[in-house]
């Protein structure tokens, strides 16, 4: 058998560090065996049999023209190996960083905090941790390890599914390359790390007969299992055409109607989500809808102009006790607390 | 010779922005997290964030979050910060660091002077 | 985060004193912490990493020790050219939180 170990990474290939000692061993002889070792393709000596190092080349603080195929001869000029010899640096600890766009599943994704130069893997698993004791504000490993599985075709991401929403667990992400392995634990609770993707199907439709309105509608995000008990809130922004600045509403349901827009210009709407009890963080913005205010047709019955209902619209309040947690339905209405007062008279 | 060195600060209103640069030379900086520290004059050291070699990872105080940004281009050897929203609180000499690996810095610039003021 | 304290704020020291200023870490931060110094008007400098190696080029009367909350930072023989001040740093966490800063300074 081979005196040398073999180093995790392709075979006949050696590891070092620049700046420092690297051994080399020549694989194919004995333990202690006296070798002659060569720069493959050129014929000069580097090290003669009576060394003294046996199977092993020292190379005193190894620089990047250290790097290359060396060969090994035996005393009666029998190849006793080639080795590569490839520098680079032990990991470091990856980076890593954690999400979940729904309260079941979450994915972390790592990158490597320096370039090690040399063939890297990593190894994801992950933790969950309880509290020891009722009174205690200590938390300590204590099922698992479990492995985070990675996703297929190399990206540097895993995913940890059927989550416990109110746990904490402890994910561990450990770079490996031939010089040693780096570890990085990272604590996760789910609701910290909570951001939903943005709602879906955003469509914004005038109103007929009230050019200043707009009826914006959207849906959960696919992603969002649809239980009761952990709903969205959303948060809207408008504004018009060639304006820089958005108005924002945080509507009740999956609908929300606009009451101040400016008649006869297009408005850019869109729509972010976030756990209705405030975990975790907003969604990014859905698309921006684009939708224009209709003309607007003049009741029938018009009022002399001194008789003009000029007050706010009030939508009728209903004294109904709230649910912790809404529907998952939308809350239908056309008048909402923030009409203003419309280009086109509305009837008292 | 290894070397950092920054650009871009100056005098700021309230509510401005900037952005700061940090050029690399005498290492290879594709190969290192990239750190923005910030000293207030006449006080501690604070860190403000980090960016891993192939850019893909970020990280912010607190204090900055949703303001700043950080970036980077590997075939420039360049380091930047985008300054979005500066407050007052912000006034002061910004360093670029360089790791190794993620929040040791064994390498500064000499630094940067932002000041916000109306 | 983490919070990292320093001891003393300040100190005045007599030239070949040995100098002592004490860190702690609000939670375990196993031996990921950092020494700088840093003379007046220029860029902080590392002097120990991961609680107890010197940095290349270093003085060796710089030294480190400590682990989990608790780590002390030693100048064995004060120098002149030791006048500054002395920053403890934390990097165990994705955000690195640095200490308020020990100066110091000759008698």
């Known amino acids: 058998s081979s005196p040398c170990p073999q180093a995790w990474g392709p075979p006949g290939v050696q590891y070092g560090q620049p700046g420092r000692s690297v051994k080399l061993c020549c694989p194919g002889v004995t333990a202690g065996d006296p070798v002659s070792w060569f720069r493959d393709g050129e014929p000069k000596l580097l090290q003669g049999p009576d060394s003294g190092l046996g199977h092993e080349l020292v190379l005193a603080q190894a620089d990047s023209t250290d790097e290359g195929t060396y060969i090994c001869q035996t005393l009666d000029g029998a190849l006793g190996g080639t080795v590569t010899l490839q520098l680079g640096y032990p990991p470091a600890r990856p980076v890593v960083s954690c999400q979940a766009a729904d309260y079941e599943n979450f994915s972390c994704t790592w990158s490597p905090s320096q370039i090690s130069g040399l063939p890297t893997r990593y190894l994801t698993s992950y933790r969950k941790k309880t509290v020891l004791g009722a009174d205690s504000q200590r938390r300590s490993p204590s099922t698992g390890p479990w492995p985070c599985p990675q996703d297929p075709l190399g990206a540097a991401r895993c995913v940890v599914h059927g989550a416990e929403f109110w746990s904490q667990y402890r994910i561990n992400v450990t770079e490996v390359n031939p010089l040693g392995a780096s570890t990085r634990l990272l604590d996760v609770s789910l609701q910290s790390i909570l951001r939903p993707d943005p709602p879906q199907g955003l469509r914004v439709e005038s109103v007929p007969g009230y050019p200043r309105r707009l009826r914006a509608s959207w849906t959960y995000p696919a992603s969002w299992p649809c239980q009761p008990h952990f709903l969205l809130k959303f948060r809207l922004q408008y504004r018009p055409a060639q304006h820089p600045a958005w108005s924002t509403v945080e509507p009740a349901g999956l609908e929300e109607v606009i009451t101040d827009a400016v008649a006869g210009l297009p408005h850019a709407v869109r729509v972010s989500a976030r756990d209705f009890l405030d975990a975790g963080t907003w969604s990014t913005w859905s698309p921006e809808a684009w939708g224009t205010p209709s003309t607007g047709t003049i009741p029938k019955e018009i009022p002399a102009w001194g008789q003009l209902h000029t007050q706010p619209e009030v939508e009728p309040q209903v004294d109904s006790p709230a649910p912790p947690r809404p529907s998952l339905q939308p809350h239908p209405r056309l008048l909402d607390h923030r009409d203003s007062v419309e280009q086109v008279a509305v009837l008292a | 010779e290894v070397q950092l060195l920054e650009s871009g600060g100056g005098l700021v209103q309230p509510g401005g922005s900037l952005r700061l640069s940090c050029a690399a030379s005498?290492?290879?900086?594709?190969?290192?997290?990239m750190t923005w520290v910030r000293q207030a004059p006449g006080k501690g050291l604070e860190w403000v964030s980090s960016?891993?070699?192939?850019?893909?990872?970020?990280q912010y105080a607190d204090s900055v979050k949703g303001r700043f940004t950080i970036s980077r281009d590997n075939s420039k050897n360049t380091l930047y910060l985008q300054m979005n929203s500066l407050r007052a609180e912000d006034t002061a000499v910004y360093y670029c660091?360089?790791?190794?690996?993620?929040?040791?810095?064994?390498?500064w610039g000499r630094g940067t002077l932002v000041t916000v003021s109306s | 985060d983490i919070q990292m304290t320093q001891s003393p704020s300040s100190l005045s020291a007599s030239v070949g004193d040995r100098v002592t200023i004490t860190c702690q870490a609000s939670q375990d931060i196993n031996n990921y912490l950092n020494w700088y110094q840093q003379k007046p008007g220029k860029a902080p400098k590392l002097l120990i990493y991961?609680?107890?190696n010197l940095q290349t080029g270093v003085p060796s009367r710089f030294s480190g020790s400590g682990s989990g909350t608790d780590f002390t930072f030693t100048i064995s023989s004060l120098q002149p050219e030791d006048i500054a001040t002395y920053y403890c740093q934390q990097h165990e966490s994705q955000s690195p939180t640095f200490g308020p800063g020990t100066k110091v300074d000759i008698k």
């Open positions: 660091a360089k790791g190794p690996g993620w929040g040791s810095f064994d390498l």
């Open positions: 005498g290492f290879t900086f594709s190969t290192y997290s």
């Open positions: 960016i891993v070699p192939y850019g893909d990872l970020t």
């Open positions: 991961d609680a107890s």
